[in-house]
Interface confidence: medium
């Protein structure tokens, strides 16, 4: 070993640098955080990317850079340093149109405190080792959302679209008239029926457990769906994103009262069935192949 | 393509009856509303009445009392028309909100529609 090298291993190994890292990493996220910096931490960011550029090299003369087994570009956590350190020079010296898109790679400066604390790297780890697990787990996920997307395609495509209508319409206006001229929430509200408090009109359905509508109403299918069109069964996408919604359970009350109004309370079964397989199973098999992963990386 | 076909009109004398009957024809998924109109010679359309599927029924103010709108099954209409006066000649259409299929919008749909002639 040249006597370069024995220097640098004996930095590499020092706690004291561990320390000057941790501590230089967050002295540049605190700069980081700052919403107009004075001019003088421009010469404070240079002494971080010089800091960043030491550590590199020192870790360079140490290991060697990429020839054999056990060298600098060989783990993973070294590949971000590298990274941090070319988009430093890069945002300073190369005149690129740009820069602001550029200076977003700053941040990654914030997770170079996952590779100097220990603790840190073990979470990571062991998060990584779950997506790798989780493969198959998100493959059975996908598959059954899919089906059941199918299945909500095949039960309620349009269904959400079901609105009680005014009966009492002028001689002439047909509901084709009616909405090429509606343009505002208040022409809605004149023909649709609301509900007190509701932004969307009233759901409806056509069989006999559906919901039906008030006196002088009847229910028509036009117009778009609820909560701004983004609320349907209409289309595989959006009857996937329904089914997510009930997965994660993310305001699924919601999304079940409006379905089984306009087609009908026998439909609860299917949400019952997505609720205890999607919900229920699935996402706590996902959590059980996290906690599984975390485990052996503990290990 | 759904139709809508009207029958019943002809010539009646002041006083008479006469009894117009509407069908859908073509594949129906859904009728959600059926209404009678009508329209004398020189004038607008207007509302003479309509049924809904949950039994709301509506007239127009020159027809209460001498009028009957009924709906025997989903598909079809009827207007009695009894106690005809001579301003009661007109053209008379029969219009339906309905759904070809599940899965198409609600759209208005009109007959050809049937004259009626109340003279003596």
């Known amino acids: 070993f040249s006597p370069l090298r024995r220097i640098s291993i004996k930095i590499l190994v020092h706690s004291l640098f561990s320390m000057l890292i941790m501590c230089t990493i967050l002295t540049n996220c605190i700069f980081m955080t700052m919403n107009n910096p004075p001019d003088w931490t421009k010469n404070v960011e240079y002494t971080f990317t010089g800091i960043y550029t030491f550590e590199s090299l020192v870790k360079i003369l140490a290991r060697g850079f990429c020839v054999g087994e056990f060298t600098f570009l060989r783990d993973p956590w070294n590949w971000l340093d590298f990274v941090v350190i070319v988009f430093a020079y890069l945002t300073e010296f190369v005149n690129l149109g740009n820069v602001s898109a550029l200076r977003t790679f700053r941040v990654l400066r914030a997770l170079k405190t996952i590779s100097v604390i220990p603790g840190l790297k073990t979470i990571v780890g062991a998060l990584i080792q779950s997506v790798k697990k989780l493969s198959d787990v998100m493959i059975l996920t996908v598959f059954c959302l899919s089906v059941f997307a199918l299945i909500g395609l095949q039960l309620f495509m349009g269904n959400l679209k079901h609105k009680c209508f005014r009966n009492s319409l002028e001689n002439n206006e047909t509901l084709e008239s009616i909405m090429n001229t509606l343009e505002s929430e208040e022409d809605f509200r004149k023909y649709f029926y609301y509900l007190e408090g509701s932004k969307d009109a009233l759901l409806c359905g056509f069989s006999t457990d559906s919901g039906q509508c008030p006196e002088g109403y009847t229910c028509v299918k036009i117009g778009r769906n609820p909560d701004y069109g983004y609320t349907s069964f209409d289309t595989f996408s959006w009857a996937f994103l329904a089914l997510f919604r009930l997965m994660t359970q993310d305001y699924w009350e919601n999304l079940y009262q409006q379905t089984l109004r306009a087609a009908g309370k026998t439909y609860m079964i299917f949400f019952v069935v997505v609720i205890f397989l999607g919900s229920f199973y699935l996402i706590n098999l996902i959590l059980a192949v996290v906690a599984m992963a975390y485990e052996e990386q503990n290990q | 393509e759904v139709q809508l076909v009207e029958s019943g009109g002809g010539v009646v004398q002041p006083g008479g009856s006469l009894r117009l009957s509407c069908a859908a024809s073509?594949?129906?998924?859904?009728?959600?509303?059926m209404a009678w109109y009508r329209q004398a010679p020189g004038k607008q359309r207007e509302l003479v009445a309509y049924?809904?599927?949950?039994?709301?029924i509506s007239y127009a103010d020159s027809v209460k009392g001498r009028f009957t709108i009924s709906r025997d099954n989903s598909k079809r209409v009827y207007l009695q028309m009894n106690s005809l006066r001579p301003e009661d000649t007109a053209l008379y259409y029969c219009?339906?909100?309905?759904?070809?299929?599940?899965?198409?919008?609600?759209?208005?749909?009109w007959g050809q529609g049937t004259l009626v002639t109340v003279s003596s």
């Open positions: 219009r339906a909100l309905l759904q070809p299929d599940s899965y198409s919008n609600t759209r208005t749909y």
């Open positions: 073509g594949p129906v998924f859904n009728i959600n509303r």
């Open positions: 049924v809904t599927p949950t039994g709301d």
